[in-house]
Interface confidence: low
Amino acid sequence: GWVWNQFFVPEEMNTTSHHVGRLRSDLDNGNNSFQYKLLGAGAGSTFIIDERTGDIYAIEKLDREERSLYILRAQVIDITTGRAVEPESEFVIKVSDINDNEPKFLDEPYEAIVPEMSPEGTLVIQVTASDADDPSSGNNARLLYSLLQGQPYFSVEPTTGVIRISSKMDRELQDEYWVIIQAKDMIGQPGALSGTTSVLIKLSDVNDNKPIFKESLYRLTVSESAPTGTSIGTIMAYDNDIGENAEMDYSIEEDDSQTFDIITNHETQEGIVILKKKVNFEHQNHYGIRAKVKNHHVDEQLMKYHTEASTTFIKIQVEDVDEPPLFLLPYYIFEIFEETPQGSFVGVVSATDPDNRKSPIRYSITRSKVFNIDDNGTITTTNSLDREISAWYNLSITATEKYNIEQISSIPVYVQVLNINDHAPEFSQYYESYVCENAGSGQVIQTISAVDRDESIEEHHFYFNLSVEDTNSSSFTIIDNQDNTAVILTNRTGFNLQEEPIFYISILIADNGIPSLTSTNTLTIHVCDCDDSGSTQTCQYQELMLSMGFKTE
């Protein structure tokens, strides 16, 4: 049978020929009658065999990391017979490892993100180096990790390459760190080879900073003419955190202002001071509000950083605007009796300059020929007034600042003209009546009514009478109905168209005014030729002709 030991050849041998070992047949008695042959990959090129002795030599420098073993076949032939002495057999030559490879970090570049202020021991990242040497051969591939750069904030576990935090870090002081890790083989013993890698460790932000106002006191100004909703200025706080952690909300502390509000511009993180209610320089010329600022998002576990909100004081000055004169009342109503003489007193309007300088005021009336106003606001008449022409006057009074004529205010003034009894009552219409020749006594000829252009204080009451002449010699009589109407009745039987075709009756109408006024009104009564039923015949023709303006004989 075949006789050999396990074959090893060290890698990286520089000699031209290195004895690996010997294989032989136990039938070989050393008389050189056997011939040994080597077959397989590497035979003849990497390994050769001494055909007589069976000694194997490596004739090439070997690299275990390229090829760690060779499987070869051996033959032995009896040269006298040419026959195989032993069956062909496979054998293995192992390339034994030397520490000729340094550890390499294959997953470079390394980058890790860890929250700032993370506690000691927090895992950051694991780095792993590879060593091409034989892990089963001694310590050639047994690695130890150490930190070359990164103290005192980081540490590395020697056997695992796990990087951990060893000291709290503040992103606001430094937001990234370069850590250099070394891996050494031979577990760090003499002759060890090493490799290094860099790890970029970025600190992610946590909300460990509250926003703080840039200024402890802000001064803003607002015009008293500014409408509600006007932005009067901005305030700004700074937060050393970033992103969502730097988003903030501004507010007025303890809601101490009904006049101003603060809204937050979430794009610029500014506080915008808004006018909530119109201001008046003459009422209050400056305001003070205290504003506070807080982060929009704060986690419960980070509340300790946000216990007391930053505050600032805002002093707001109101800018005076020249305002138009201000009337004491929004409108005025005055009364004056009709028929009072021109220059009569109507009433007084009053306007003042609301500004501090208190400019004198000038007054005027827009488009009025009936009234006048002086610089004291006194309104007088320029003509006598007649209530029956106009009972009310709607005036527009303008007040102008003496030193700034552009500052103008106008208000309506209503003047009521009060009635006096200056009109007697009169017929409410033109009356033209007729009576038949054959009319009997007491026949109703006409019902009359009256009107009075004066305004009734309570209710008009009219009194109807015939004139003295007509009372004494009248063919007609009058009865007052006591309801502002009266009836005219015949006072005799029979009338003659030929003798007296027309009667003119004077009727006196008095009112109940103080003093009472009386008017004389003429009632025309035509005598008509009537048939037996009382229907007028000639009279109708006459009336028609009269109404058309023709005179009948």
Partner: antibody
Framework: QVQLVESGGGVVQPGRSLRLSCAAS????????MDWVRQTPGKGLEWVAV????????YYADSVRGRFTISRDNSKNTLFLQMNSLRVEDTAVYYC????????????WGRGTLVTVSS | EIVLTQSPGTLSLSPGERATLSCRAS???????LAWYQQKPGQAPRLLIY???SRATGIPDRFSGSGSGTDFTLTISRLEPEDFAVYYC????????FGQGTKVEIK
């Protein structure tokens, strides 16, 4: 005439208190915001505190906040500065000053009163 | 806070000469809220200029102020004997801060 007169200054030990007064005359005291300003050889002029015309708002410099209190009595035309927990660095001449109505600069100053904090 | 730096520290001039005092702010002073004061030994400061360029009541027209933003100047066109004093600038746009002063002395 229009004037401000301070009083109440003196020598005091650190940690002790002092109350300064400022008497106003010749103008409508209740219409003006009033301030205290101090002057030290080392730091020059330094604003200390302000109080609104009606006493509704008060504001302090960071260096004195929590220790000093500004107040006023409009019926007596007097401004006060209560100084507690005094420190050596509070040694200065203290002036009361009137703020103008239309701005925030000081158009009227008192002659000042010296406060010395020394052990 | 806004820091005001005055220069020069001391200005030695003769009566009748022109004095130019500078005041520089560490950041822009809003709306030219800058005032100048004069202080004589043992006296309170006296307001000279407000709003960077407006003369206070009763101040002679030889005193003038100019500037905006961060650079301001007080000019005394012809120095009178009573003008020799210490001059302070003050900003009132953001809280109140004063410059360290410029002493104008007789040469």
């Amino acid at each position: 005439q229009v004037q401000l007169v301070e009083s109440g200054g003196g020598v005091v030990q650190p940690g002790r208190s002092l109350r300064l007064s400022c008497a106003a005359s010749g103008f409508s005291f209740s219409s003006y915001d009033m301030d205290w300003v101090r002057q030290t050889p080392g730091k020059g002029l330094e604003w200390v505190a302000v109080i609104w015309y009606d006493g509704s708002n008060k504001y302090y410099a960071d260096s004195v906040r929590g220790r000093f209190t500004i107040s006023r009595d409009n019926s007596k035309n007097t401004l006060f500065l209560q100084m507690n927990s005094l420190r050596v660095e509070d040694t200065a001449v203290y002036y009361c000053a009137r703020e103008t109505g239309e701005g925030w600069y000081f158009d009227l100053w008192g002659r000042g009163t010296l406060v010395t904090v020394s052990s | 806070e806004i820091v005001l730096t005055q220069s020069p520290g001391t200005l030695s001039l003769s009566p009748g000469e022109r004095a130019t005092l500078s005041c520089r702010a560490s950041q822009s002073v809003s709306s030219s809220y800058l005032a100048w004061y004069q202080q004589k030994p043992g006296q309170a400061p006296r307001l000279l200029i407000y709003g960077a360029s407006s003369r206070a009541t009763g101040i002679p027209d030889r005193f003038s102020g100019s500037g905006s933003g961060t650079d301001f100047t007080l000019t005394i066109s012809r120095l009178e004997p009573e003008d020799f004093a210490v001059y302070y600038c003050q900003q009132y746009g953001s809280s109140w801060t004063f410059g360290q002063g410029t002493k104008v002395e007789i040469k």
